[in-house]
């Protein structure tokens, strides 16, 4: 719960947040996600680093792996085999991109309390996982996939063509990892471990981004990444399935691509196993408004995978791209053919639909001027999902249960009234058959994680309530937060305003706009956070506002797809419109308004500063995109089409930051970028800087050597300290 406001007599014992508090993570919170291993059991790493198995029904717990064993190999992670005979221990974690990392893996035999010797795993491994049943292992080493029937067995090599930066088996290349799969893996076990499906990505023809990594040596290293920018050659993807019982018998079998997809450039978007002999693949045209879901069956006689046209389901958008950020994935029903899926209804709101024979005959399960966000679980009688329906606040998330085993299906909100003030933004984690589930509440009060009975929804126990955080915040003057909306020209602009603790409407305050604004994003959420902007409000007396404008998510397709093929226009307009409305509220000092953003937000903040409105005194762009021609094909083309004359080249050229260099003359601009940014390349800021220099426009800049898109570690402290100084100077606040 947010600590309640104290009376004036006590106010002198309260202190404001400091920048140090933020940088030290003093007020960070914990969540508890059970590592489910059955309907009623989960694993959890205790405070003293033992791996403990909890049985909800008996109330008993026991240590399955001691902290001593963990420490003996410096393990930072673990994974129990489904037959509970072995545990893999992960150490030497080495981060690669957003999701990917390499590590060393040790296998510990629980039956004899010893590490498995003989046929040890090679190092470093790019990905490793147990089969869903038993203790088979699949792993990726040097871009090739290997299989072990038992941890001590010699490996069976499934692929042989893996080559660094050329052919990726079982793991995604850069663009698939970041923009399509959002995982470090590209292999999938069938439910009982009979088959293993995997993707092969061929990056041979993809242009390479190269940048210097300075390190400590005499000569910098050059990092080379096959990275398709907008309009460039894309990876070529193929999906294979191998029978893991007799892997050498017929070898990997390729799954056919639907003809309507294969006729031009395409992507593979996800794979979902239905049964051991039925698999569902999703494909997407390069022009991402057509998606095809293909259900394929194993042909015992031919030992191949058959994907009949009658089992192809097409999802097409006529007003934008297919799906939200990604195309949604299906959740299959117990008949192993029909499924539930979220897509736009006829009114342009994303809702759950039930698909059996054809998409045209889909039965709409949820409806209304709100959106279903995620389907968590489907059982024989219930479907659990999250939505932002409750009280019409798009920035909330509640968990609902629909009874599907009876007619008419009845809907119940599981979370809406649990801790109504404290908890308005939930996610959930379900055990097998949804026998139990954990609810994780992210705010707006102090986060809390609880365990519930899957049949009655009764709360069984609190898993994590962040008591220490609550106590630590008792003498802190936190800013006030408001979530409200502006109605402007038939558009609803939701905003979050963070106000200084002693906010007085009759006074004037400097305003900082924090913007992200990317397609299908949402910044105005009912979540708890004590972060840099909390400090700016608490200690420095600033008002901070976040605004969800056109292009943002969960409020219907009209708002979401408004930016289709026109990035950089309406997102900026809506931030400016909101600022004008905030000025009208009477408590904003219109001579002291700033804007800042990171990544897409850096692009929007740059364009807002260069809009020529005279509204902004200063602003900051961290790791901004400066031209859509510089960014990844999969992301960029989804929203912008292709940078070709017969498609959308004109808007690619019109929407650059460089084209507006002249307009930065009357603002103070701070441009920041990491030189080793694999995502939004340093090239983006280099080009902005070049354009500003060529236009003879003064600006400030900071680079972070060898830092990526996240600017982590010591760079974080330096970054926020530097930005604080810049803003205080801009707002004439004493240091």
């Amino acid at each position: 719960l947010r600590p309640s406001r104290v009376h004036n007599s006590e106010e002198n014992t309260m202190r404001a947040l400091t920048l140090k508090d933020i940088l030290n993570g003093t007020f960070s919170y914990k969540t508890f996600f059970p590592n489910w291993i059955s309907g009623q059991e989960y694993l959890h790493q205790s405070a003293d680093n033992n791996i403990v198995l909890y049985n909800i029904e008996t109330g008993q717990s026991y240590t399955i792996l001691s902290n001593r064993t963990m420490k003996s190999v410096n393990a930072s992670n673990y994974g129990l085999s489904p037959d509970r005979q072995f545990v893999y221990l992960e150490s030497d974690y080495s981060k690669l991109w957003r999701y990917s990392y390499t590590a060393t893996y040790y296998i510990y035999d629980l039956s004899n309390g010893e590490f498995v010797r003989g046929n040890e795993l090679p190092r470093p491994i790019q990905y490793l996982c147990w089969s869903p049943v038993g203790s088979k292992l699949a792993y990726v080493y040097q871009n090739n996939i290997y299989l072990k029937q038992r941890p001590g067995d010699p490996p069976f090599q499934i692929t042989f063509n893996g080559r660094e930066n050329k052919i990726f088996n079982g793991i995604p290349d850069w663009v698939y990892e970041e923009e399509m799969l959002a995982t470090k893996y590209a292999l999938w076990w069938s439910p009982n471990g009979k088959f293993l499906a995997y993707a092969e990505f061929n990056d041979t023809d993809i242009p390479v981004i190269a940048y210097s990594y300075y390190g400590d040596e005499q000569y910098p290293r050059t990092i080379n990444i096959p990275y398709p920018k907008a309009g460039a050659k894309n990876p070529v993807v193929r999906i294979f399935i191998i029978d893991t019982t007799y892997p050498a018998y017929v070898g990997p079998q390729e799954v056919p691509v639907p003809a309507m997809i294969a006729s031009s450039d395409y992507y593979f978007s996800w794979l979902t196993w239905v049964t051991d002999e039925r698999v569902c693949l999703q494909w997407l045209k390069r022009v991402q408004n057509v998606s095809v879901l293909s259900i394929c069956d194993f042909r015992e006689d031919w030992q191949t995978w058959d994907c009949p046209k009658t089992q192809e389901h097409i999802e097409e958008s006529r007003t934008g791209w297919a799906g939200g950020f990604f195309v949604s994935t299906p959740v299959f029903s117990y008949d192993a053919i029909s499924y539930y899926k979220i897509f736009s209804d006829k009114d342009g709101y994303k809702h759950i639909h039930y698909i059996k024979d054809t998409v045209e005959n889909a039965i709409q399960i949820t409806s209304g001027k709100w959106e279903a966000i995620n389907i968590f679980r489907v059982t024989q009688d219930s479907l659990f999902y999250s939505s932002n329906e409750f009280e019409e606040y798009p920035g909330r998330r509640n968990i609902y249960r629909i009874s599907i085993g009876s007619y008419p299906p009845s809907k119940k909100c599981v979370t809406c009234h649990l801790r109504k003030e404290r908890c308005q933004y939930y996610t959930a984690s379900f055990s097998d058959y949804a026998k139990y589930y954990a609810l994780v509440c992210y705010g707006p009060g102090i986060p809390i994680s609880t365990l519930h009975d899957g049949r009655t929804d009764q709360e069984i126990k609190i898993l994590e309530e962040n008591k220490e955080l609550e106590n630590a915040l008792k003498n802190i003057q936190l800013p006030k937060e408001e979530i409200k909306k502006l109605e402007v020209d038939e558009i609803t602009l939701w905003y979050k305003m963070i106000l200084p603790p002693q906010f007085d409407r009759s006074k004037k305050y400097p305003l900082l706009i924090q913007v992200y604004g990317g397609p299908c994003s949402q910044s105005v959420r009912s979540v708890f956070a004590v972060n840099w902007i909390s400090y700016l409000a608490s200690k420095e007396g600033m008002v901070i506002a976040l605004v969800d404008g056109r292009g943002t998510a969960f409020q219907g397709d009209k708002l979401l797809y408004a930016v289709y093929r026109k990035l950089g226009v309406y997102e900026v307009e809506d931030q400016i419109t909101a600022v004008r409305k905030f000025i009208e509220m009477g408590f904003i000092d219109e001579k002291r308004i700033a804007i800042w953003g990171w990544s897409y937000g850096g692009y929007v903040s740059s364009l807002a500063l260069a809009s020529g409105t005279g509204l902004f005194k200063c602003g900051i762009a961290v790791a901004p995109v400066s031209s859509w021609e510089y960014y990844a094909s999969v992301y960029t083309e989804r929203f912008m089409g292709l940078p070709t004359k017969d498609d959308n080249l004109e808007h690619y050229k019109n929407s650059t930051v460089m084209a507006r260099a002249e307009y930065f003359r009357n603002v103070d601009y701070l441009l920041i970028h990491g030189t080793a940014d694999d995502n939004v390349h340093f090239q983006n800021s280099a080009q902005i800087a070049k354009a500003l220099v060529n236009a003879q426009v003064d600006f400030q800049a900071m680079w972070y050597s060898d830092q990526n898109h996240g600017l982590s570690g010591l760079s974080t402290n330096h970054l926020y300290t530097h930005m604080t100084h810049f803003l205080k100077q801009c707002f004439s606040l004493s240091d």
Partner: antibody
Framework: EVQLLESGGGLVQPGGSLKLSCAAS????????MSWVRQAPGKGLEWIGE????????NYTPSLKDKFIISRDNAKNTLYLQMNKVRSDDTALYYC???????????????WGQGTTVTVSS | LVMTQSPSSLSASVGETVTITCRAS??????LAWYQQKQGKSPQLLVY???TLADGVPSRFSGSGSGTQYSLKINSLQPEDFGSYYC?????????FGGGTKLEIK
């Protein structure tokens, strides 16, 4: 006890119209999918069409789509079949059938009426 | 989808076991029902989901199959089992019936 009672059958001239009714009792009619099925003399069963509980979904066999209309009145616990432009090959015993909801999202024809005879002849 | 039932007629004696088959022109994914119709009476549901017996149906009846091929087996025929049998799919509209199988006493 579940009962479905068809009525409204009889002799009708080719090109004419007829409205069949099916009165339901002994169950919660407003939660059931309902169907019409016909059986020509000495022949097999032919599915005509279905209507879901709130009348938001009505499906027909393609050959009858433009001449038959299925409707229901949940307040009166009654299912209807409006037959237009009838021909001699529409002569049959017409059954209404009611279905349990089966997971997931479909029904079966658990209950049948005794049928009403429609004869199309000049 | 066309449902082809075979045989169209069949004679058997009390106590025998008979099997009626139904072939769909496309995969109907177990969305299949079997009905029994006695002379001058309405049809009665026997089996749904290809293999689930409806309430009150004797256990001598059993349904099986998958994909496009389905069958209804009657073990130890009883005098009351004689009549016509129909299969019907529920995969996609129109929910067509098979042509029927007439089971007669030998």
């Amino acid at each position: 006890e579940v009962q479905l009672l068809e009525s409204g059958g009889g002799l009708v001239q080719p090109g004419g119209s007829l409205k069949l009714s099916c009165a339901a009792s002994g169950f919660d009619f407003s939660t059931y999918w309902m169907s019409w099925v016909r059986q020509a003399p000495g022949k097999g069963l032919e599915w005509i069409g279905e209507i879901n509980p709130d009348s938001s979904t009505i499906n027909y066999t393609p050959s009858l789509k433009d001449k038959f209309i299925i409707s229901r009145d949940n307040a009166k616990n009654t299912l209807y079949l409006q037959m237009n432009k009838v021909r001699s090959d529409d002569t049959a015993l017409y059954y209404c059938a009611g279905g349990y909801y089966r997971y997931p999202y479909y029904y079966t024809m658990d209950y049948w009426g005794q049928g009403t005879t429609v004869t199309v002849s000049s | 989808l066309v449902m082809t039932q075979s045989p169209s007629s069949l004679s058997a004696s009390v106590g025998e076991t008979v099997t009626i088959t139904c072939r769909a022109s496309g995969n109907i994914h177990n969305y299949l029902a079997w009905y029994q119709q006695k002379q001058g009476k309405s049809p009665q549901l026997l089996v749904y989901n290809a293999k689930t017996l409806a309430d009150g149906v004797p256990s001598r009846f059993s349904g099986s199959g998958s994909g496009t091929q389905y069958s209804l087996k009657i073990n130890s025929l009883q005098p009351e089992d004689f009549g016509s049998y129909y299969c019907q799919h529920f995969w996609s509209t129109p929910y067509t019936f098979g042509g029927g199988t007439k089971l007669e006493i030998k």
